[in-house]
Interface confidence: medium
């Protein structure tokens, strides 16, 4: 839980955050775990600690190893570990799997590719973007803030996309690159006003007090990949996150495609250890996209 993998390329900047979070006012000490040697905080050093961040400016292959961060409050010390690996630059264009960040997928309607880890760095727009090592040129490609938008995505837009930016530290500039795969869903899609498949409006579900129960909100939005389509639950008109009841949890929406090509999303509301007071709540299944909002209400009753 409190160990995190980080990686980078030699001669580039790498910034790592301590996986053990604390209040921003807390002191954070960093150590190289193998030697228990303290990481200096003076910025003149190539590797230095800056609060919750560990900075390699630039990184070297020999920096690889496990780094310990100790977050110190006035009365408590809590420990986290950053497992850092610095790789040699590849002579050819090929980016090996171990340097790849998570894959993202897109379609004609939604083709944002975010530059990984960029929020840790002091960078200025615009980003440079490369696909399979070739600089992206042309009006189809728009570098916007920390992401790339591709207009009229086609299947051959799939590939490995690398963002390159400059990190500035006290007037000195350091290059950073990060690569992730982009896959394209090949479909001619369209979007509709949301259609809620379940629950039926004003449905009542019978539950056993003390048992667990799941409510599924399922809605369809059209065909193909959908832009800004969400399915969520509300309790008495409030977001689940605003309703401080740990027994009631909403799962992240799961995308579902049917044989007829409909793009649907299911969001499950899990209620653990059903209580009498849960029967008094109004459960709203909300489906929202650019066309509008549809709401179905369900209530619970005792079996």
């Amino acid at each position: 839980k409190f160990s995190k993998q980080s990686w980078g390329l030699e001669n580039e900047a790498l910034i790592v955050r301590c996986p053990r979070q604390g209040k921003s006012s807390y002191i954070v000490d960093w150590y190289y775990s193998q030697t228990n040697k303290s990481i200096p905080t003076q910025e003149r050093n190539r590797v230095f600690a800056s609060g919750q961040l560990l900075k390699f400016l630039p990184a070297e292959v020999a920096d690889s190893g496990i780094y310990t961060c100790i977050v110190r409050s006035p009365t408590f010390n809590r420990t986290g570990y950053a497992n850092v690996t610095i790789y040699k630059k590849q002579p050819d264009c090929n980016v090996p799997d171990y340097l790849m960040y998570s894959t993202v997928s897109g379609s004609e309607k939604n083709s944002k590719i975010y530059c990984p880890t960029i929020d840790l760095y002091n960078w200025t727009a615009p980003l440079e973007w490369f696909k399979n090592c070739q600089a992206l040129q042309g009006s189809r490609y728009k570098a916007h803030k920390s992401f790339l938008v591709i207009d009229n995505v086609m299947t051959d837009d799939a590939g490995d996309y690398t963002c390159k930016f400059i990190h500035n530290e006290n007037g000195a500039n350091y290059s950073v690159t990060a690569t992730r795969s982009f896959t394209v869903k090949d479909e001619q899609g369209f979007s509709l006003f949301p259609v809620i498949r379940a629950p039926a409006h004003n449905e009542t579900k019978e539950v056993e007090i003390g048992e667990n129960t799941n409510l599924t909100c399922s809605a369809c939005f059209g065909k193909g990949a959908q832009f800004l389509a969400t399915v969520q639950w509300q309790l008495n008109g409030n977001k689940i996150t605003d309703f401080s009841e740990p027994r009631i949890q909403q799962e992240e929406g799961q995308n579902q495609s049917f044989s007829n090509g409909l793009a649907c999303v299911n969001t499950v509301l899990r209620i653990a250890d059903v209580k009498e007071e849960d029967l008094l709540l109004r459960y709203d299944c909300l489906a929202l996209n650019l066309h509008g909002l549809r709401r179905h209400t369900i209530r619970l009753s005792r079996k």
């Epitope: 604390g22 209040k23 809590r78 420990t79 740990p246």
Partner: antibody, heavy 123, light 107 residues
Framework: EVQLLESGGGLVQPGGSLRLSCAAS????????MFWVRQAPGKGLEWVSA????????YYADSVKGRFTISRDNSKNTLYLQMNSLRAEDTAVYYC????????????????WGQGTLVTVSS | EIVLTQSPATLSLSPGERATLSCRAS??????LAWYQQKPGQAPRLLIY???NRATGIPARFSGSGSGTDFTLTISSLEPEDFAVYYC?????????FGQGTKVEIK
């Protein structure tokens, strides 16, 4: 020196109400999440309620939800627990305690506790 | 909610002996586990946090170990003032929960 001092306990009939207070000193009260924990006579510890430093987020155990309300007045360095519809099973020593770390609703340990105030619910 | 089960319920030992107290969680709590000591008529006192770290001012004879679901509090050599009830507490998720306690009594 950190100090927490509970008050407001006493004998109350079932269905009655009581308001507990906890006066804090020796630390920046508004920077800390605060808790109420209770202990029935001869029994173990049971978490009752928690409130974030700024007072916006509150949390309750199932056994008291809808009956108890936690609040705080940061200008007075005081934590409160309003207890309504009291039952015999609410009889316990009520402790207020400080969470020295919690960030955004993730709890930690309780490093300072008051000496407790006894609430007895009986007819 | 996460249930913490402490064993044994009572431990009868003499001063100078080693005490080993166990706390088992119904699901993994990583290292988000604390130990408290409580003497009669007093409030609980924090001993250990993050499974193995001693709180400020706690003597070195107290040590904690374990992660996931199985945890141990060890008192290497019991002092007269160590005879008390010990509770474990998890804080990985709401609601925080306590074990039912282990009483360490003089044999």
């Amino acid at each position: 020196e950190v100090q927490l001092l509970e008050s407001g306990g006493g004998l109350v009939q079932p269905g009655g109400s009581l308001r507990l207070s906890c006066a804090a000193s020796g630390f920046t009260f508004s920077s800390y999440d605060m808790f109420w924990v209770r202990q029935a006579p001869g029994k173990g510890l049971e978490w009752v309620s928690a409130i974030a430093g700024e007072g916006g987020r509150t949390y309750y155990a199932d056994s008291v939800k809808g009956r108890f309300t936690i609040s705080r007045d940061n200008s007075k360095n005081t934590l409160y627990l309003q207890m309504n519809s009291l039952r015999a099973e609410d009889t316990a020593v009520y402790y207020c305690a400080r969470d020295p770390w919690s960030t955004e609703g993730s709890f930690f340990v309780l490093d300072y506790w008051g000496q407790g105030t006894l609430v007895t619910v009986s007819s | 909610e996460i249930v913490l089960t402490q064993s044994p319920a009572t431990l009868s030992l003499s001063p100078g002996e080693r005490a080993t107290l166990s706390c088992r969680a119904s699901q993994s709590v990583d290292d988000d586990l604390a130990w408290y000591q409580q003497k009669p008529g007093q409030a609980p006192r924090l001993l250990i946090y993050d499974a193995s770290n001693r709180a400020t001012g706690i003597p070195a004879r107290f040590s904690g170990s374990g992660s996931g679901t199985d945890f141990t509090l060890t008192i290497s050599s019991l002092e007269p003032e160590d005879f008390a009830v010990y509770y474990c507490q998890q804080y990985i998720g709401a609601p925080i929960t306590f074990g039912q306690g282990t009483k360490v009594e003089i044999k």
